[in-house]
C-alpha cells in the first residue's frame, strides 16, 4: 500500500495547526515539563513489518484524537482550530485504515503488534494521568501540546521510511 501524498501533507498541516493552538506563553511553563517516556523504539520502524508499523501509527493518531476530544480539551483550545485538527486526524486515520486493509494477506506476519499497541496506549495513559494530576492547567496542556507535536514529528519520520520501503 502506498500512503498517499495527501497523508504526508495532512501530517504537516496537523503540526501547523498544533503550533497555532497555544494560548499562553510556553516560557512560563518550564517547571511543568515532564518525562512521558515517549516509546521511541516503537517508531524506529526497523523491527516492524509494514502493516505493524501502520497499526502503531494508527493507534497514536487515534489516541491523540481521543485526548483532544475530551471536554477539558474543548474548554482549553480554540474551537475553530480544534475542528481543523479533528479533520486532519480523521483524514490520516482513514488513509491508514485503507492501507491496513490492502496489507491484509500481503504479509505472513500479523497485522498488529499487540505489545507495541499497548506501549502506545500506556504512553497516552501517562499523558492523561499527568493532565489529571495538574488539574488540566493551561501549562499542563502546553506541555502536552509540545509533547504531541514532538511525537507527530517523530512519527512522520516513520511514515517517510515506510514510503521509501515501497
Amino acid at each position: 500500500c502506498d500512503l498517499p501524498q495527501t497523508h504526508s501533507l495532512s501530517n504537516r498541516r496537523t503540526l501547523m495547526i498544533m503550533a497555532q493552538m497555544g494560548r499562553i506563553s510556553p516560557f512560563s511553563c518550564l517547571k511543568d515539563r515532564h518525562d512521558f517516556g515517549f516509546p521511541q523504539e516503537e517508531f524506529d520502524g526497523n523491527q516492524f513489518q509494514k502493516a505493524q508499523a501502520i497499526s502503531v501509527l494508527h493507534e497514536m493518531i487515534q489516541q491523540t484524537f481521543n485526548l483532544f476530544s475530551t471536554k477539558d480539551s474543548s474548554a482549553t483550545w480554540d474551537e475553530t482550530l480544534l475542528d481543523k485538527f479533528y479533520t486532519e486526524l480523521y483524514q490520516q486515520l482513514n488513509d491508514l485504515e485503507a492501507c491496513m486493509m490492502q496489507e491484509v494477506g500481503v504479509e505472513d506476519t500479523p497485522l498488529m503488534n499487540v505489545d507495541s499497541i499497548l506501549t502506545v496506549r500506556k504512553y497516552f495513559q501517562r499523558i492523561t494521568l499527568y493532565l489529571t494530576e495538574k488539574k488540566y492547567s493551561p501549562c499542563a496542556w502546553e506541555v502536552v501540546r509540545a509533547e504531541i507535536m514532538r511525537s507527530f514529528s517523530l512519527s512522520a519520520n516513520l511514515q517517510e521510511r515506510l514510503r521509501r520501503k515501497e
Epitope: A19, P26, F27, R33, E147
Partner: antibody
Framework: EVQLVQSGAEVKKPGESLKISCKGS????????IGWVRQMPGKGLEWMGI????????AYSPSFQGQVTISADKSISTAYLQWSSLKASDTAMYYC??????????????WGQGTLVTVSS | DIQMTQSPSSLSASVGDRVTITCRAS??????LNWYQQKPGKAPKLLIY???SLQSGVPSRFSGSGSGTDFTLTISSLQPEDFATYYC?????????FGQGTKVEIK
C-alpha cells in the same frame, strides 16, 4: 549533524547599531528555542533571553530587557541578537544555544562558537 | 529571580583526584539543574541535565546529584582534559540563571 553557526567578530564604536546571527542546521529549527548568553571578558555566563522561532515569541532577562532585541527568521533557520546603540560595556562574547522548549530533553545541548563583540571609541 | 551559588569558586586538584562541586539554588528548582564545562576560548559544553542525566558523549566519570535546592557535580577521577571552569544553571523558571562558576586548576 546539528550545528549552530554564528556570524563573525565585530568591532564597533559606542552608539552604533549591530545585529549578530546564529544559523541552525541539522535539525528542525522551529522545534527548538534559541537562547542567547553573554560572557564578558574573564567573567561568567549570563542568560540574556530566548526565542521560539516557530512564532517569534520572546522572553528576556530583566537585566537585558530593553537593551537588546532577539528575533528569528524561520525561513532561513536563523536567530538574531541586535543592539540599536552599543555601549563599551557591551564588549563581550555572545553565544547562542538551542533549548528543547517544553519537551523533556537536554537544555542548551548545542552551542554556537560565539561572536566576539568589541565596542571601543 | 532564582540565585545560583556555586562553591568553591576555584579549586586545585591532581589527576586522579575525586572532585566535588556544589550548587545551591535560592529556592526549590526540583531537578531542573544543568552542569556545563567551559574551556578557555571555547563555548560551554553540556555535561549533566535534569540534575543527574549524563549528556550523550560525556564520560561516565562525571555524575550529578541533588534535587530541590542542593546539587552536586562529581568527577570521580580527574583527567588532564577536565581542567576547566564548571557552571551550574537552573531551567526551572525564567529568567534562566547560572552559577558564578568553579575553576578547576592543576595542583
Amino acid at each position: 549533524e546539528v550545528q549552530l553557526v554564528q556570524s563573525g567578530a565585530e568591532v564597533k564604536k559606542p552608539g552604533e547599531s549591530l545585529k549578530i546571527s546564529c544559523k541552525g542546521s541539522g535539525y528542525s529549527f522551529t522545534s527548538y528555542w534559541i537562547g542567547w548568553v553573554r560572557q564578558m571578558p574573564g567573567k561568567g555566563l549570563e542568560w540574556m533571553g530566548i526565542i521560539d522561532p516557530s512564532d517569534s515569541d520572546t522572553a528576556y532577562s530583566p537585566s537585558f530587557q530593553g537593551q537588546v532585541t532577539i528575533s528569528a527568521d524561520k525561513s532561513i533557520s536563523t536567530a538574531y541578537l541586535q543592539w540599536s546603540s552599543l555601549k563599551a560595556s557591551d564588549t563581550a562574547m555572545y553565544y547562542c544555544a538551542r533549548h528543547p522548549g517544553l519537551n523533556w530533553a537536554p537544555d542548551f545541548d548545542y552551542w554556537g562558537q560565539g561572536t566576539l563583540v568589541t565596542v571601543s571609541s | 529571580d532564582i540565585q545560583m551559588t556555586q562553591s568553591p569558586s576555584s579549586l586545585s586538584a591532581s589527576v586522579g583526584d575525586r572532585v566535588t562541586i556544589t550548587c545551591r539554588a535560592s529556592q526549590s528548582i526540583d531537578d531542573f539543574l544543568n552542569w556545563y564545562q567551559q574551556k578557555p576560548g571555547k563555548a560551554p559544553k553540556l555535561l549533566i541535565y535534569f540534575a543527574s542525566s549524563l549528556q550523550s558523549g560525556v564520560p561516565s566519570r562525571f555524575s550529578g546529584s541533588g534535587s530541590g535546592t542542593d546539587f552536586t557535580l562529581t568527577i570521580s577521577s580527574l583527567q588532564p582534559e577536565d581542567f576547566a571552569t564548571y557552571y551550574c544553571q537552573q531551567s526551572h523558571t525564567l529568567p534562566l540563571t547560572f552559577g558564578q562558576g568553579t575553576k578547576v586548576e592543576i595542583k
